[in-house]
């Protein structure tokens, strides 16, 4: 006899990153004919919705106006049918963006690079902190960490045209406060270049484009819950 | 066209410090790393380290860490390499080079240290 | 940090000869390799970036090539202003490391 329900999938829209005194949703999903939602956050009760009618709705949101570091953190959410209640979901990481300062981000040899040469991103934030994320930008939001004093290193290997992309970095200064992002370096990566002598490091887009990464994450988001359940558990872990 | 001025020529007395520097032109500088490579003389080449104008990132190779210091001046387009404590083991031809994959070389500077 | 090993460390050859360099990485630098030309008087030029691209301006005698971690240059033809000191450079990992020199002398 099943003793509990399927686990949910959580998420946030419109990203689990969140620029603080901006407004995000959680989101939960689970079966319908669930009574009863339950938000935990740090491992406490946060939130609970009772959907009506619970026979027609299998999602719920947890509105938040107003980010700021006491709500960034580690989410999950169960649901309950009758007497029965789920497994809990996967943790979300919501993390809090926009805090203190604003990384630089350089690319090693250069933002224009041949199939197979090998890459290092450099994240500089001169202010205390000692943890650095690197992210790529897509639907699954790639994410590497690394550490230093006033900046980090990300070696990527050698290349391929899947390295190709925009990239950003954040200074965190902890798991789920972080800085502003830096300026994005957009990653060329070509099997031949006529000549990549002093190809340009700078943008080749403005900065208020990370609007449109939000946009843009959220799309693929809703296309695929479970990947992205699955990335922001592991985000920061 | 791309050019890196350095000073033919820097005398210095053991124990003091030198500050050498690199002019570039032709190119938008805060955009490229600027690497620093020494040269012994009848010897072969090695990397000091490098920097990013823009960012202010920094590499250097740890051999070098505790003798130079890389920095920039934006204003001027102007790369530096302090040298420390010096002794004649410092003497050598130091050439700055332009782009992340050292596309463009300094003339290079010979430094001699000399009481 | 990479060692590169070059050889042969000097060459005599002779005007319209075929010669090849060559470096060996220690470790894995994928495709991050130039050569440099050095004149005596010390002037530096890249010649070859990314193990097998031309730069700009430099005569199609040259060329660059890679078989697993070996790393070669090949002047096709020598002519007398190719006979100078040449260096491979690995940027793929900090330190970057040059090779010891080529000294390509004329017989």
């Known amino acids: 006899q099943q003793q509990t329900l399927p686990k949910p999938f959580i998420w946030a829209e419109p990203h689990f990153m969140v620029p603080k005194e901006k407004q995000v949703t959680i989101c939960c999903q689970g079966n319908y004919g669930a009574v009863e939602y339950q938000l935990h956050f740090e491992g406490s009760l946060f939130a609970v919705d009772r959907p009506k009618p619970p026979e027609r709705i299998n999602k719920v949101q947890f509105y938040i106006p107003d980010m700021n570091s006491r709500m960034a953190g580690q989410y999950s959410c169960i649901y309950r049918v009758g007497e029965l209640w789920s497994e809990p979901s996967n943790l979300l990481d919501l993390v809090v963006t926009e805090m203190y300062d604003t990384p630089t981000l350089s690319v090693h040899p250069g933002p224009e690079v041949i199939s197979g040469e090998k890459v290092t991103f450099y994240c500089r934030l001169d202010t205390a902190t000692s943890m650095f994320l690197l992210l790529k930008e897509g639907r699954s939001s790639h994410v590497q960490r690394g550490y230093g004093k006033v900046q980090a290193e990300f070696p990527l290997g050698p290349v391929t045209t899947a390295h190709r992309g925009t990239y950003r970095c954040f200074g965190s200064y902890n798991n789920h406060a972080w800085s502003f992002p830096s300026e994005p370096v957009k990653l060329l990566v070509t099997g031949d270049i006529e000549n990549t002598s002093l190809a340009p490091e700078d943008p080749t887009f403005p900065a208020d484009t990370w609007g449109t990464y939000l946009l843009t994450t959220e799309t693929g988001l809703q296309k695929d819950h479970a990947l992205w359940d699955h990335t922001a558990q592991n985000l920061l872990r | 066209q791309v050019q890196l001025q350095q000073p033919g020529a820097e005398l210095v007395k053991p124990g003091a410090s030198v500050k050498l520097s690199c002019k570039a032109s032709?190119?938008?500088?805060?955009?490229?790393?600027m690497h620093w490579v020494k040269q012994r003389p009848g010897q072969g080449l090695e990397w000091i380290g490098m920097?990013?104008?823009?960012?202010?990132?920094?590499n250097y190779n740890e051999k070098f860490k505790s003798k130079a210091t890389l920095t920039v001046d934006k204003s001027s387009s102007t790369a530096y390499m302090q040298l420390s404590s010096l002794t004649s083991e410092d003497s050598a031809v130091y050439y700055c080079?332009?782009?992340?994959?050292?596309?463009?070389w300094g003339q290079g500077t010979t430094l001699t240290v000399s009481s | 940090d990479i060692q590169m090993t070059q050889s042969p460390s000097s060459l005599s050859a002779s005007l319209g000869e075929r010669v090849s360099l060559t470096c060996r990485a220690s470790?894995?630098?994928?495709?991050?390799l130039n050569w440099l030309q050095q004149e005596p008087d010390g002037t530096i030029k890249r010649l070859i970036y990314?193990?097998?691209s031309l730069d700009s301006g430099v005569p199609k005698r040259f060329s660059g090539s890679r078989s697993g971690s070996d790393y070669s240059l090949t002047i096709s033809s020598l002519e007398s202003e190719d006979f100078v000191d040449y260096y491979c450079?690995?940027?793929?990992?900090?330190?970057?490391?040059f090779g010891s020199g080529t000294k390509l002398e004329i017989k």
């Open positions: 470790q894995d630098i994928g495709s991050s």
């Open positions: 450079l690995q940027y793929a990992s900090s330190p970057f490391t």
């Open positions: 032709g190119f938008t500088f805060t955009n490229y790393w």
């Open positions: 990314a193990t097998s």
């Open positions: 920097i990013h104008p823009n960012s202010g990132s920094t």
């Open positions: 080079a332009g782009g992340g994959r050292l596309d463009y």
